[in-house]
């Protein structure tokens, strides 16, 4: 489990405490409070400060990562005096026992795999557990299907992503009978971790002078518009010399995805395949199946 807290302020002051399950920081209420403020400072020199009303004695953090260690701070002014207290949140447990190389990816629009490796100093009996919370509703999802390596959980498969939002909090806790295991946590944007399927319904129609390629944008987990897609077409002339470069064409997403290019008859046999990416991320999908068009005698016009 995540660590207990050490306080670096007079113990008599505010009695600040943090609940990592709810991300709630609380302190003893003071009479006649005129001002209160809570925030944390992380290792990236950023300050995270939730909204707080003067009469509240707690605050909830929405989007924070804790595994590198953070410092919480509470400032309270009353009509008589001012209080300040800091709270260090260390990642207790033996160094190097936390899950490492953590990554997740969404695929096929509604499936997700997360994988990690056991920490280099973790004991043989270590067991890891993944919890996911979305950043808005704070609903917790426990891993339903673990991927195992010699009995140790080293991954997770989810086939229901309905609880996720555009940014989600991932926590990998560890347990062992021998020693304390450090935790790993991460905030991941679905935008960064979704891997698109290749475009579907790729067709090629040719007339005497041109060929028109059409395709459909892939179904995605995120709600995206056509403007969010970038495509690459690989138009390849068959039976060319080894080392001949393929023609790679970049096409921006459109309401109707199409690419028209000059190709006069008789045309040699060609193939075309397409891949897709989020225009702001450029994590390319795999290529669609190659569609052939043209022929040695130039008679073939329409291909699915």
């Amino acid at each position: 489990e995540k660590s207990d807290l050490r306080t670096v302020a007079p113990a008599s002051s505010l009695n600040v405490r943090f609940d990592s399950r709810t991300m709630n920081l609380s302190w003893d209420c003071q009479e006649n409070t005129t001002f209160s403020k809570c925030f944390l400072t992380d290792k990236k020199n950023r300050v995270v400060e939730p909204r707080l009303s003067n009469n509240e004695c707690s605050c909830t953090f929405r989007e924070i990562c804790l595994h590198e260690g953070v410092t919480f701070e509470v400032h309270v002014n009353t009509s008589q005096r001012g209080f300040q207290q800091k709270l260090l949140y260390p990642n207790s447990g033996r160094e190097g026992t936390a899950a490492q190389n953590f990554s997740c990816f969404i695929y096929n629009a509604d499936l997700m795999n997360c994988t990690w490796a056991r920490g280099p100093t973790a004991p043989r009996d270590v067991q890891y557990f993944l919890y996911i919370r979305n950043s808005k509703r704070r609903r917790e999802i426990r891993c339903p299907y673990y991927i195992q390596d010699s009995g140790t959980h080293v991954g997770c498969h989810l086939d229901n992503l309905s609880g996720l939002t555009s940014r989600n909090y991932f926590l990998v806790n560890g347990t062992s009978r021998e020693i304390g295991i450090q935790f790993f946590d991460s905030l991941l944007d679905t935008k960064k971790i979704e891997r698109f399927n290749p475009p579907s319904n790729v067709t090629v129609r040719c007339n005497t002078t041109h060929c028109l390629v059409r395709w459909k944008q892939p179904r995605t987990y995120q709600k995206l518009s056509y403007l969010d897609f970038q495509y690459q077409l690989d138009v390849h002339r068959k039976n060319t010399q080894p080392g001949t470069e393929n023609l790679l064409i970049n096409v921006s997403g459109d309401l109707e995805n199409r690419y028209n290019f000059p190709s006069s008859e008789p045309r040699a046999k060609h193939s075309v395949k397409i891949r897709a990416a989020d225009v702001r991320i450029l994590n390319w999908s795999s290529w669609s199946e190659a569609i052939e068009f043209g022929s040695d005698d130039g008679h073939h016009h329409h291909h699915h």
Epitope: K44, V48, P50, R62, R280, I281
Partner: antibody
């Protein structure tokens, strides 16, 4: 099309506070994360922080800790940046900025910018 | 935090010429890179995101390339209105940091 319109230039004395506004049109403030970027005269761009009007949480650079407050009024779709204990090195153009895809700690590119508010700190 | 370094600091060219601006990240930022153009007295304008995708309304003489740590903004044929300051920005890791800028001036 979204537009961000900022308040006018301000001249302040060292130690004073300034509050800059950024009015959103073509969108509602609750749909956005609003960011503030500043630019000292003749210098580059510096991200100050971002604010989520929906949950009220702010993420900002530690160098501004204790001096910066980012807020929003969802009834008027206006975001605010307040900077206190002003010093001469705070003299800069202050921009509000947002994008099509944002979180409070940044955007996947800032698509939309206010026109900037010049804050001059001088005794 | 990730440090973005742009070069050259100033680039002097004539209209019609080709401009090549460089941006280097202190660690890999994948393709999470944007380019902005800023003219005197104006706010920055987004030109490129995803290292190579042009933002809406940006002429095709502007192109971006690169991934990982090394990125390039190319203006194939300079128009008089292209003379400005250009900034790169990474959005891989918060805080999202800007380069110090390259001033493109008329020779």
């Amino acid at each position: 099309q979204m537009q961000l319109v900022q308040s006018g230039a301000e001249v302040k004395k060292p130690g004073a506070s300034v509050k800059v506004s950024c009015k959103v049109s073509g969108h509602t403030l609750t749909e956005l994360s609003m960011h503030w970027v500043r630019q000292a005269p003749g210098k580059g761009l510096e991200w100050m922080g971002g604010f989520d009007p929906e949950d009220g949480e702010t993420i900002y650079a530690q160098k501004f800790q204790g001096r910066v407050t980012m807020t929003g009024d969802t009834s008027t779709d206006t975001a605010y940046l307040e900077l206190s204990s002003l010093r001469s090195e705070d003299t800069a153009l202050y921009y509000c900025a947002t994008g099509r895809y944002c979180h409070k700690d940044g955007c996947y590119g800032f698509d939309y910018w206010g026109q900037g508010t010049l804050v001059t700190v001088s005794s | 935090e990730i440090v973005m370094t742009q070069s050259p600091a100033t680039l002097s060219l004539s209209p019609g010429e080709r401009a090549t601006l460089s941006c280097r990240a202190s660690q890999s930022v994948s393709s999470y890179l944007a380019w902005y153009q800023q003219k005197p007295g104006q706010a920055p304008r987004l030109l490129i995101y995803g290292a190579s995708s042009r933002a809406t309304g940006i002429p095709d003489r502007f192109s971006g390339s690169g991934s990982g740590t090394d990125f390039t903004l190319t203006i194939s044929r300079l128009e008089p209105e292209d003379f400005a300051v250009y900034y790169c920005q990474q959005y891989d890791s918060s805080p999202h940091t800007f380069g110090q800028g390259t001033k493109l001036e008329i020779k």
